[in-house]
């Protein structure tokens, strides 16, 4: 599996999408797990509804949500209020019995909030008709890792 990089800004929401073959994975629940180390286990963060026919219902675990478009074949994970400690390698999984197939390997990168590093003169403030509350920003940039890139930095 190639690894896809999703970049999000600290404090904002990041949406990760994992496409899959809906017929191949028909009737299977899905999960989002975090890779513990390069060869470690993948620790379950959140999984879709217990009943596959209700997979479209958003399920939360803390600040992470999962929802599955089982007919269209897209699993969507939302990481709300992204924090630096959310950075790392994850997997979208398709579950069958006690087994799990990897749908996509995902590297989440957390970018510093640019507003935290600007002079007051450079800051943009919303006008009278604009407010941050009205804007639901889900910033997401994704790319595949280049050959030779490693998702885990070498440990000394």
């Amino acid at each position: 599996h190639n690894t896809t990089v999703f970049q999000g800004v600290a404090g904002q929401s990041l949406q990760v999408s994992c496409p899959y073959d809906s017929m191949k994975h028909w009737g299977r629940r899905k999960a989002w797990c975090r890779q513990l180390g390069e060869k470690g286990p993948c620790q379950r963060v959140v999984s879709t509804h217990n009943l596959w026919l209700l997979s479209f219902l958003r399920r939360w675990n803390g600040s992470t949500a999962i929802t599955d478009d089982t007919l269209g074949g897209t699993l969507t994970i939302t990481l709300r209020n992204l924090q630096p400690h959310d950075a790392g390698l994850y997997q979208c999984q398709s579950l069958h019995g006690s087994e799990a197939d990897t749908l996509r390997k995902v590297l989440v990168e957390v970018l510093a909030d640019p507003l935290d590093h600007r002079d007051a003169g450079d800051l943009w403030f919303p006008g009278e008709s604009e407010s941050f509350e009205d804007a639901h920003v889900e910033h997401s940039i994704s790319r595949s890792l280049l050959e030779g890139e490693i998702p885990f930095p070498p440990t000394s």
Partner: antibody
Framework: EVQLVESGGGLVQPGRSLRLSCTAS????????MSWFRQAPGKGLEWVGF??????????EYTASVKGRFTISRDGSKSIAYLQMNSLKTEDTAVYYC?????????????????WGQGTMVTVSS | DIQMTQSPSSLSASVGDRVTITCQAS??????LNWYQQKPGKAPKLLIY???NLETGVPSRFSGSGSGTDFTFTISSLQPEDIATYYC????????FGGGTKVEIK
């Protein structure tokens, strides 16, 4: 008029089988998830299982206590949902209801059940 | 599995009274909760879905609120035809019902 009518209930011995029918009218049957519920005498409601709409190719889900014994199916041409009950136990004695899952205006559905049949009594006793 | 604790199990109130029933989930169920009315010998009837949405054709004296683990069902002014048992039903885990609340007239 939107309507569901159950039939097929009756007295049956433990270990035997029974098939309930739920005949739908007044709506496009294939567009809806159909569910079965039951209510033991003097007790509360219990979900038995449901079968997905045509888009979900009749995929079924069941509560743990009936899994492997009960089977839900549907016949789109007749607008009938079935509940096949095998290896019946005395604790399966109840009024059985079929119900329709509610559809949102945009086409999705919610597991709230907006149309119910009148119920059919199933008594499992020797 | 999620347990749904409904209270009280029964209540008696006068016509015109405000009646409140609560349903507590054993864990967070977002707003994935419905309320039904069942009259003796009859099938259940959907009143409220998604915790607070009034089903079409249901009188506005019925309402629902809450999210997470604590939910409330209210009849703002009890009518004689409201004599029934009321059930909550979650759909976050499976489709579990509360034990029911029997409402009677004083």
């Amino acid at each position: 008029e939107v309507q569901l009518v159950e039939s097929g209930g009756g007295l049956v011995q433990p270990g035997r089988s029974l098939r309930l029918s739920c005949t739908a009218s007044g709506f496009t049957f294939g567009e809806y998830t159909m569910s079965w519920f039951r209510q033991a005498p003097g007790k509360g409601l219990e979900w038995v299982g449901f079968i997905g709409s045509k888009a979900y190719a009749g995929t079924t889900e069941y509560t743990a206590s009936v899994k492997g014994r009960f089977t839900i199916s549907r016949d789109g041409s007749k607008s009938i949902a079935y509940l096949q009950m095998n290896s019946l136990k005395t604790e399966d004695t109840a009024v059985y209801y079929c119900a329709r899952g509610k559809r949102y205006s945009y086409g999705g559905w919610v597991p709230a059940f907006d149309v119910w049949g009148q119920g059919t009594m199933v008594t499992v006793s020797s | 599995d999620i347990q749904m604790t409904q209270s009280p199990s029964s209540l008696s109130a006068s016509v015109g009274d405000r009646v409140t029933i609560t349903c507590q989930a054993s864990q967070d169920i977002t707003n994935y909760l419905n309320w039904y009315q069942q009259k003796p010998g009859k099938a259940p009837k959907l009143l409220i879905y998604d915790a607070s949405n009034l089903e079409t054709g249901v009188p506005s004296r019925f309402s629902g609120s809450g999210s997470g683990t604590d939910f409330t069902f209210t009849i703002s002014s009890l009518q004689p035809e409201d004599i029934a048992t009321y059930y909550c039903q979650e759909y976050d885990s499976y489709l579990a019902f509360g034990g029911g609340t029997k409402v009677e007239i004083k």
